[in-house]
Interface confidence: low
């Protein structure tokens, strides 16, 4: 069963995934996709690395860790309810059926609505994580947020920005439903 991770609307979500390169710079291709890991590849790819670099990405999906050292944990910025669901981290080890597959369940909760402060503030927080040789760490250490920061300024400003219907539509429609051709 999938390990569950949580984040609130407007925050950044962090989905951990790690492997140990055989040698420094000897990277294994990795793909992240929305939906459970299929037999091969990733479905609905949102980010992909090759032996050297990130070669496919979209604007809200980032590798904030050092992927050259095997930290291929995914950060999804400014999440919406539509980002909820299963994500696949697939470490594409050469050889027939050698891939390591990890299904991670992301649960997005509505933001806690509080009266807008008289003076807008920025909040950042860091959460501990447990590095593992392969796969992901215990869920309780990875409950929400990105490393190194979470930006919560949207909570007090999102209501104003949502008056722009284009923003509202894009927050709903973009990001999690992108794939490579």
């Amino acid at each position: 069963s999938e390990v569950e991770y949580r984040a609130e609307v407007g925050q950044n979500a962090y989905l951990p995934c790690f492997y140990t390169p055989a040698a420094p710079g000897n990277l294994v291709p990795v793909c992240w996709g929305k939906g459970a890991c299929p037999v091969f590849e990733c479905g609905n790819v949102v980010l992909r690395t090759d032996e050297r670099d990130v070669n496919y990405w979209t604007s809200r999906y980032w590798l904030n860790g050092d992927f050259r050292k095997g930290d291929v944990s995914l950060t999804i910025e400014n999440v919406t309810l539509a980002d909820s669901g299963i994500y696949c981290c697939r470490i594409q080890i050469p050889g027939i059926m050698n891939d390591e597959k990890f299904n991670l369940k992301l649960v997005i909760k509505p933001a806690k609505v509080t009266p807008a402060p008289t003076r807008q503030r920025d909040f950042t927080a860091a959460f501990p994580r447990m590095l593992t040789t392969r796969g992901h760490g215990p869920a309780e250490t990875q409950t929400l947020g990105s490393l190194p920061d979470i930006n919560l300024t949207q909570i007090s400003t999102l209501a104003n920005e949502l008056r722009d219907s284009r923003l509202a539509n894009d927050l709903r429609d973009s990001g999690a439903t992108i794939r490579i051709g």
């Epitope: 979209t58 429609d173 051709g181």
Partner: antibody, heavy 118, light 113 residues
Framework: QVQLVESGGGLVRPGGSLRLSCAVS????????MSWVRQAPGKGLEWVSG????????YNADSVKGRFTISRDNSKNTLYLQMNSLRAEDTAVYYC???????????WGQGTLVTVSS | EIVMTQSPDSLAVSLGERATINCKSS????????????LAWYQQKSGQPPKLLIY???TRESGVPDRFSGSGSGTDFTLTISSLQAEDVAVYYC?????????FGQGTKVEIK
């Protein structure tokens, strides 16, 4: 209203360096990924570099990899492009642009001209 | 990367007449799960930065006159100016945002005949 104002362009010799800045106002800067897009004289648009809202991740076009570095200071609402080892083919107007949604550009600055010539 | 090709490179149209610009992508930019085409159109007037006109292939940006419309799906797209006005003289670019890096067409110059 949204404003993006670039600065730092100018004439530089091949192999030289420049640092472009883009001062931003009118939206929550840290909530949006940003980009640099350039346009050589009389030519079309070319995406150069992008950075996530937090600044934690950056991506560059192959043509500038290893030479250009994009960064941002969210406390100053400013986007930067450090350009090293400049070549004649880097001559262009450089625009900073706000990335919206999946990766289109809903606001652009007026641009700053970079000329690389001996 | 996805290559975007526009046609024609330039066109001259009489005031009040229809102008049509085509854009072709080297691979589909339609994502079937949400039935959206990851394509935008920009207008760039002389000496000015580009301006977003249309995104998701057919959604007009706020404030853009309704004489501008976008259509098409998959790999073939069209920007139509239903009744050309003097202020529409510009270069128009398509851009895909389906797969990184984002890429633009080479541009189509629209002039008054």
């Amino acid at each position: 209203q949204v404003q993006l104002v670039e600065s730092g362009g100018g004439l530089v010799r091949p192999g030289g360096s420049l640092r472009l800045s883009c001062a931003v106002s009118g939206f929550t800067f840290s909530s949006y990924a940003m980009s640099w897009v350039r346009q050589a004289p009389g030519k079309g648009l070319e995406w150069v570099s992008g950075i996530s809202g937090s600044g934690g991740s950056t991506y560059n076009a192959d043509s500038v990899k290893g030479r250009f570095t994009i960064s941002r200071d969210n406390s100053k609402n400013t986007l930067y492009l450090q350009m090293n080892s400049l070549r004649a083919e880097d001559t262009a107007v450089y625009y900073c642009a706000k990335i919206f949604g999946s990766y289109y550009f809903d606001y652009w600055g007026q641009g700053t001209l970079v000329t690389v010539s001996s | 990367e996805i290559v975007m090709t526009q046609s024609p490179d330039s066109l001259a149209v009489s005031l009040g007449e229809r102008a049509t610009i085509n854009c072709k992508s080297s691979q589909s930019v339609l994502y079937s799960s949400n039935n959206k085409n990851y394509l935008a159109w920009y207008q760039q007037k002389s000496g000015q930065p580009p301006k977003l006109l249309i995104y998701w292939a057919s959604t007009r940006e706020s404030g853009v006159p309704d004489r501008f419309s976008g259509s098409g799906s998959g790999t073939d797209f069209t920007l139509t100016i239903s009744s050309l006005q003097a202020e529409d003289v510009a270069v128009y670019y398509c851009q895909q945002y389906y797969s990184g890096p984002p890429t633009f067409g080479q541009g189509t110059k629209v002039e008054i005949k």
